[in-house]
């Protein structure tokens, strides 16, 4: 059956031979209605990429550099299955390209000019493409030929396989630049030896190199890693201090109609029957015909790439930046230490309008990028399409797991002169009911619930975390009779109460009328029994403070808070009747943009922050008529974080633990992708 057939692309006679053997052996173990293999032979990996894009083949396994080619238009392929190395219990699908230095040296990443460098080899990922790609815009002009520019940047190097006649400085630390193990400074171990022997000041290798060459921790402690933010970290901290994370070997397919489920079904079956130590007659990860045919011989198995993970996310911002710099050879005109405009990520139409107005008023220092969901915005920040946004704590957690960092906190209570330097404790997550109802925390089952959005702190993580510890399952849509929790599955009972309008029904953005704090409260007013919101929501939307038709006649005393002990209290008493304390919303950015984002925002809030009194005739950053567009409307200022500059420190141990527990119930495709 053609639709059940996976057309594998082979790039040599030997690969084609192995592919045919793969096809025949799979036929013998799979049912006739299961997936099958067909083989397509092409002259090169690039030809395979083109063939898959043109629907003449379905899959091929590629190195990272070729995954980049596959992702570029017009190919638009995406990673679907990753080879893993190491054990099944601790599968490694990536390695980290690092810059290793001796601890007793005193320079940072931005001070490499004039140092001596040790590389694994010309054109190799960790040893050349990534470090030179990232340093590209610091190289002296002209940058072509590249080897000459690199030779003029460092004061001496060992670059195995370079042309020692044309570029003698590249071979200064290893005469001849030998391209095999005859050169003592060749490849990973050689480049590290070049550093260890004192020939070079920095070695560009992969994270495992230092562990493979120095078994003793005391010896490893004599070395450090250079980080892209111009700090240093210990060699164990390579996950937080690397030049790029590089996928090892990946199966790619078309982004649309790519048969990814079928490819996974096929490869999963293949590893069960013909994986490491499974079969004598055919081995997936070795071949009598040659090395690394179809798959790497060193692979131990396959893992399915999460569906949310596109090629940009898979390759990572640093890797793509490095490769793009090398390939395109373009550099910004502005010096790299100058802050470029900050691209703010706006959620859907209304936030985009406010962002546009901000952009106009900032004289272009702020630019705007849009996405339909918070997770899509976070993904855009990760891949460099956007730079920053302000997030609820639940999304600060997801953003943190995806490598972003908190930059500034929204403050709600501190009057202005001290606001910028004050660390507030947070706000209260509360459960609000109508005073006329007889509801308590203990009899919510079967009632109608209103949530700000799935994954948000007050509206979801805190109440559902508490609920989970009570009911011990994740079927929250069965606990409540119906509700509105924007971001839920469209057919879930937790979308039933949402107002839309269609097709935006239950979407986690302002196009859904019951989204956010004000939306969840409106849901309670019009349809629901309980709303999970922040403690300020009721006062901010009653007593005529919200002029909308649905809110203008509401009275604060018609609503009460549910306390965890089963009692109820006035909305004026959140300190004595709340579900938990929630971390304030915070601005997040990529590490490389954090300083620029902070500097610009502090400047912007001095012009457009809460010191502006007349928002009808001036642009106000923290005002949007209860819509909480871009920032919460009750923000007094954006405050510095000082040492709370990681998501764990910012959110606090207790909240991180609560959200981590709730991950069993996670519906976040982005979180799944970021923890792959």
């Amino acid at each position: 059956v053609p639709e059940k057939s996976v057309r594998w692309c082979a790039v040599s006679e030997h690969e084609a031979t192995k592919c045919q053997s793969f096809r025949d052996h799979m036929k013998s173990v799979l049912p006739s209605n299961g997936p099958s293999v067909a083989c397509v032979k092409k002259a090169s990996h690039l030809d395979c990429i083109r063939a898959i894009a043109a629907n003449e083949a379905d899959a091929v396994t590629l190195d990272a550099g070729l995954v980049y080619d596959a992702y570029l238009a017009p190919n638009n392929l995406k990673p679907v299955v990753a080879e893993f190395y190491g054990s099944k219990e601790d599968p490694q699908t990536f390695y980290y390209a690092v810059a290793v230095v001796k601890k007793d040296s005193d320079f940072q990443m931005n001070q490499l000019r004039g140092r001596k460098s040790c590389h694994t080899g010309l054109g190799r990922s960790a040893g050349w493409n990534i470090p030179i790609g990232l340093l590209y815009c610091d190289l002296p002009e002209p940058r072509k030929p590249l080897e000459k520019a690199v030779a003029n940047f460092f004061s001496g190097s060992c670059v195995p396989c370079a042309d020692g006649t044309d570029f003698p400085q590249l071979c200064q630390l290893c005469p001849g630049c030998g391209c095999s193990t005859l050169n003592q400074y060749f490849s990973y171990s050689g480049a590290f030896k070049c550093l260890k022997d004192g020939a070079g000041d920095v070695a560009f290798v992969k994270h495992s190199t230092i562990f493979e060459n120095l078994a003793n921790k005391a010896d490893r402690d004599q070395y450090e890693l250079l980080c892209l933010d111009n700090t240093r970290k210990s060699v164990d901290e390579y996950k937080d201090c690397h030049l790029a994370r590089v996928p090892s070997h990946t199966v790619v397919a078309r982004s649309v109609g790519g048969k990814e489920d079928l490819i996974w079904e096929l490869l999963n079956q293949a590893q069960e029957h013909f994986g490491k130590d499974k079969s004598k007659e055919f081995q997936l990860f070795s071949s009598p015909h040659g090395k690394d045919l179809l798959f790497k011989d060193s692979a131990h198995g396959f893992l399915k790439v999460p569906p949310r993970m596109d090629a940009k996310m898979y390759l990572g911002y640093e890797y793509i930046t490095a490769i793009r710099n090398l390939r395109e050879g373009t550099c910004p005109e502005a010096p790299t230490d100058e802050c470029k405009p900050v691209k703010w990520c706006a959620l859907s139409h209304h936030e985009r309008l406010k962002c546009d107005e901000w952009s106009v008023n900032s004289a272009g220092k702020i630019e705007c990028e849009s996405a339909e969901t918070t997770e899509d915005c976070i993904a855009k920040i990760m891949n460099g399409e956007a730079d920053a946004m302000s997030l609820d704590g639940g999304f600060v957690y997801i953003a943190g797991m995806c490598g972003l960092v908190p930059v500034l906190a929204e403050n709600y209570n501190t009057p202005n002169p001290n606001c910028e330097n004050t660390a507030e404790e947070g706000y209260f997550a509360v459960a609000v009911v109508k005073s006329s109802s007889d509801l308590t925390w203990d009899n919510l089952k079967g009632k109608k619930s209103c949530h700000t959005a799935v994954g948000r702190t007050a509206g979801w993580n805190i109440p559902m975390g508490l609920l989970y510890s009570k009911i011990n399952h994740c079927r929250f849509d069965e606990f409540f009779s119906e509700g509105c929790a924007p971001g839920s599955e469209k057919n879930s009972s937790l979308c039933k109460l949402c107002m839309g309008p269609s097709p935006n029904l239950c979407e986690p953005n302002n196009k859904e009328g019951y989204y956010g704090y004000t939306g969840a409260f409106r849901c309670l007013v019009e349809k629901g029994d309980v709303a999970f919101v922040k403690h300020q929501t009721v006062p901010q939307n009653t007593g005529g403070k919200n002029p909308d038709a649905w809110a203008k006649n509401l009275k604060e005393e018609d609503y009460e808070l549910l306390c965890l002990d089963g009692s109820r209290k006035s909305v004026q008493e959140p300190a004595n009747c709340h579900l938990a304390r929630a971390p304030n919303h915070a601005v997040v950015a990529r590490k490389d943009k954090a300083d620029c984002v902070q500097t610009l925002l502090l400047d912007q809030q001095r012009m457009f922050g809460s010191s502006v009194t007349d928002c009808s005739s001036n642009f106000c950053l923290f005002e949007s008529k209860t819509k909480d567009l871009l920032f919460r409307d009750d923000t007094v200022c954006l405050a510095k974080l000082h040492d709370r500059n990681t998501y764990e420190k910012y959110l606090g141990e207790e909240y991180v633990k609560a959200v981590t527990n709730l991950r069993k119930c996670s519906t976040s495709p982005l979180l799944e992708a970021c923890t792959f």
């Epitope: 309008l353 406010k354 107005e357 106009v360 009808s616």
Partner: nanobody
């Protein structure tokens, strides 16, 4: 009720010029940030140029040096002078005033600009 009426669109050859006008009534025109947006066939709405109440302006990169936004507060009118027009400038152009604070969407009917030889 805010009313915005755009005019001045039409068919023009590449390299040609047009001047769009937007008459506003019922808005606090003189104190609002104003902007021109455009929507090309099958594309989303994009900001073309904006002007603050104090008259400082901002443009999208692709129109810088070719388009000029201005306002006449006494006439409650916003303008967009478009020079060196290109095929990719073809779109329906809308003006908006931000005084409503993104709370209600006030959009006129737009004016169609077609750049074609």
């Amino acid at each position: 009720e805010v009313q915005l009426v755009e005019s001045g669109g039409g068919l023009v050859q590449p390299g040609g010029s047009l001047r769009l006008s937007c008459a506003a009534s019922g808005s606090i025109f003189s104190i609002a940030t104003m902007a021109w947006y455009r929507q090309a066939p099958g594309k989303g709405l994009e900001l073309v140029a904006g002007i603050t109440r104090s008259g400082s302006t901002n443009y999208r990169d692709s129109v810088k040096g070719r388009f000029t936004i201005s306002r006449d507060n006494s006439k409650n009118t916003l303008y967009l002078q478009m020079n060196s027009l290109r095929a990719e400038d073809t779109a329906v152009y809308y003006c908006t005033d931000y005084s409503s604070r993104y709370y209600h969407d006030y959009w006129g009917q737009g004016t169609l600009v077609t750049v074609s030889s």
